[in-house]
């Protein structure tokens, strides 16, 4: 693995245990909870990160839905089942045999059912809308400077290919970052937009997943960009299947 050989740590994931027990005595880092070896040169999958994160309160509410099919992570934390690639298994169940289907970012996309519930495939989340509200500043940020800074952040910190950052919208104090990545566009080695969005979300909350790095210090032309509210909407390649009861609630 590419974990730092001298002190055997994982720069991209502090929720690992690293040991010189890889082939030839090389450093190998395994995700907490799952025990899966991770590639420390890139982001760890959200499923493995959620599995590693035993518990913590997580709040997400829907204020405005950008589309009738957009999903918001209202269920918060759970201990997911990950496949051997580290992706979410399409069907997730809790200890009481309540099951539901999830998308590729682990967000529930069906009503809850029992063990007979079938989830035939893991549906890909191809469009993520990150909706941020920044704290009051002396004046509005310059849109093009803000756009450039956020694109740089996703490229350099999260290693997300620039083509997957579809747009950055700004109407003070609201910033919207659109990430788009279809199955056909994602090549081997490309960071998944769901993983990048999760790392960003944790950074924004002051819970960085990076080892030993300082927290996220976002600045636009030297002016601090402090986020006071984050909402993330997920759009799947196939619309979710909820009962009418939920849709009208």
């Amino acid at each position: 693995h590419t974990a730092a050989q001298d002190n055997c740590t994982c720069p991209t994931n502090k929720m690992t245990v690293c040991s010189p027990d890889g082939p030839g005595g090389r450093c190998q880092c395994r995700a907490l909870g799952s025990g899966m070896a991770v590639d420390c040169s890139t982001l760890t999958s959200k499923c493995l990160l959620l599995k590693a994160r035993m518990s913590a309160p997580k709040n997400a509410r829907t204020l405005v839905r950008p589309s009738e099919h957009a999903l918001v992570d209202n269920d918060g934390l759970y201990d997911p089942d990950c496949d051997p690639e580290g992706r979410f298994k399409a069907r997730q169940c809790n200890q009481t045999s309540v099951c539901w289907c999830v998308n590729s970012v682990g967000v529930r996309r069906t009503d809850k059912g029992d063990l007979s519930l079938r989830c035939d495939e893991l549906v890909r989340t191809h469009h993520i809308l990150i909706d941020l509200r920044h704290r009051p500043t002396a004046g509005a940020f310059n849109h093009s400077d803000l756009d450039a800074e956020l694109r740089r952040l996703f490229r350099e910190r999260y290693r997300l290919h620039p083509k997957f950052v579809a747009a950055v919208h700004y109407e003070q104090p609201t910033i919207q970052i659109e990430l788009r990545q279809n199955t056909s566009q994602k090549a081997a080695g490309d960071v998944d937009i769901g993983d990048a969005a999760y790392y960003f979300e944790r950074d924004i909350k002051g819970e960085s997943l990076f080892q030993g790095r300082g927290g996220l210090d976002l600045r636009v032309r030297g002016e601090p960009l402090q986020v006071e509210r984050t909402l993330i909407y997920y759009l799947d390649e196939i619309p979710p299947k909820f009962s009418m009861k939920r849709l009208t609630a």
């Epitope: 245990v17 040991s19 027990d21 082939p23 190998q28 025990g35 070896a37 496949d83 051997p84 580290g86």
Partner: antibody
Framework: QVQLVQSGPEVVKPGASVKISCKAS????????LGWVKQAPGQGLEWIGN????????NYNEKFKGKATLTADTSTSTAYMELSSLRSEDTAVYFC?????????WGQGTLLTVSS | DIVMTQSPDSLAVSAGERVTMNCKSS????????????LAWYQQKPGQPPKLLIY???TRESGVPDRFSGSGSGTDFTLTISSVQAEDVAVYYC?????????FGQGTKLEIK
């Protein structure tokens, strides 16, 4: 050289508890995972769980949760496994092993016999 | 949990013969991050702890005779002994250490005719 030396055989009564030790030498105890494996008479191998002594991270096979408790004492480079509420089906040889791709190091095994 | 299934359960061969035994896992053991298969083969003789023969599906542990070789990827793996010796009589186990809980196959017992 790397060595894992386990405590001697135990004969205990049903319902009792027992604590098996595994003393490590020849390597840095705190930076390798140490696992425990059960082998019932004439049977195959079952992974019980593991511990990372440097940070006391512990993982259990769901089957052994509530049965086995793993601990480690870094000052003596010794790992322990306590087995509780013992029953006849807990009769087995228990091995400790240093885990990892290059870790072919096992203790000699501790035979636990549960008998009234 | 990943289920490991070995075949055959037992086999008897003459000294000098080539022998292969198989191990099938219920899920892929190939880690896409490092392209390594998390599959090991162990040899266990009566009254002894298991001895590591092969790790990473195909890498021979140091000190293991070169008549032992491992192959396969994903879900299907094979241990081959090119020329069986009398001292190879043992039970052979495959093990996955890809994701918790680590699991072993039920074992293949090798005997000499």
């Amino acid at each position: 050289q790397v060595q894992l030396v386990q405590s001697g055989p135990e004969v205990v009564k049903p319902g009792a508890s027992v604590k098996i030790s595994c003393k490590a030498s020849g390597y840095t105890f705190t930076i390798y995972w140490l696992g425990w494996v059960k082998q019932a008479p004439g049977q195959g191998l079952e992974w019980i769980g593991n511990i990372f002594p440097g940070s006391a991270y512990i993982n259990y096979n769901e089957k052994f949760k509530g049965k086995a408790t793993l601990t480690a004492d870094t000052s003596t480079s010794t790992a322990y496994m306590e087995l509780s509420s013992l029953r006849s089906e807990d009769t087995a040889v228990y091995f400790c092993a240093r885990e990892g791709s290059n870790s072919g190091y096992w203790g000699q095994g501790t035979l636990l016999t549960v008998s009234s | 949990d990943i289920v490991m299934t070995q075949s055959p359960d037992s086999l008897a061969v003459s000294a000098g013969e080539r022998v292969t035994m198989n191990c099938k896992s219920s899920q892929s053991l190939l880690n896409s991050g490092n392209q390594q298969n998390y599959l090991a083969w162990y040899q266990q003789k009566p009254g002894q702890p298991p001895k590591l023969l092969i790790y990473g599906a195909s890498t021979r542990e140091s000190g293991v005779p070169d008549r032992f070789s491992g192959s396969g990827s994903g879900t299907d793996f094979t241990l081959t002994i090119s020329s069986v010796q009398a001292e190879d009589v043992a039970v052979y186990y495959c093990q996955s250490d890809h994701i918790y809980p680590y699991t072993f196959g039920q074992g293949t017992k090798l005997e000499i005719k």
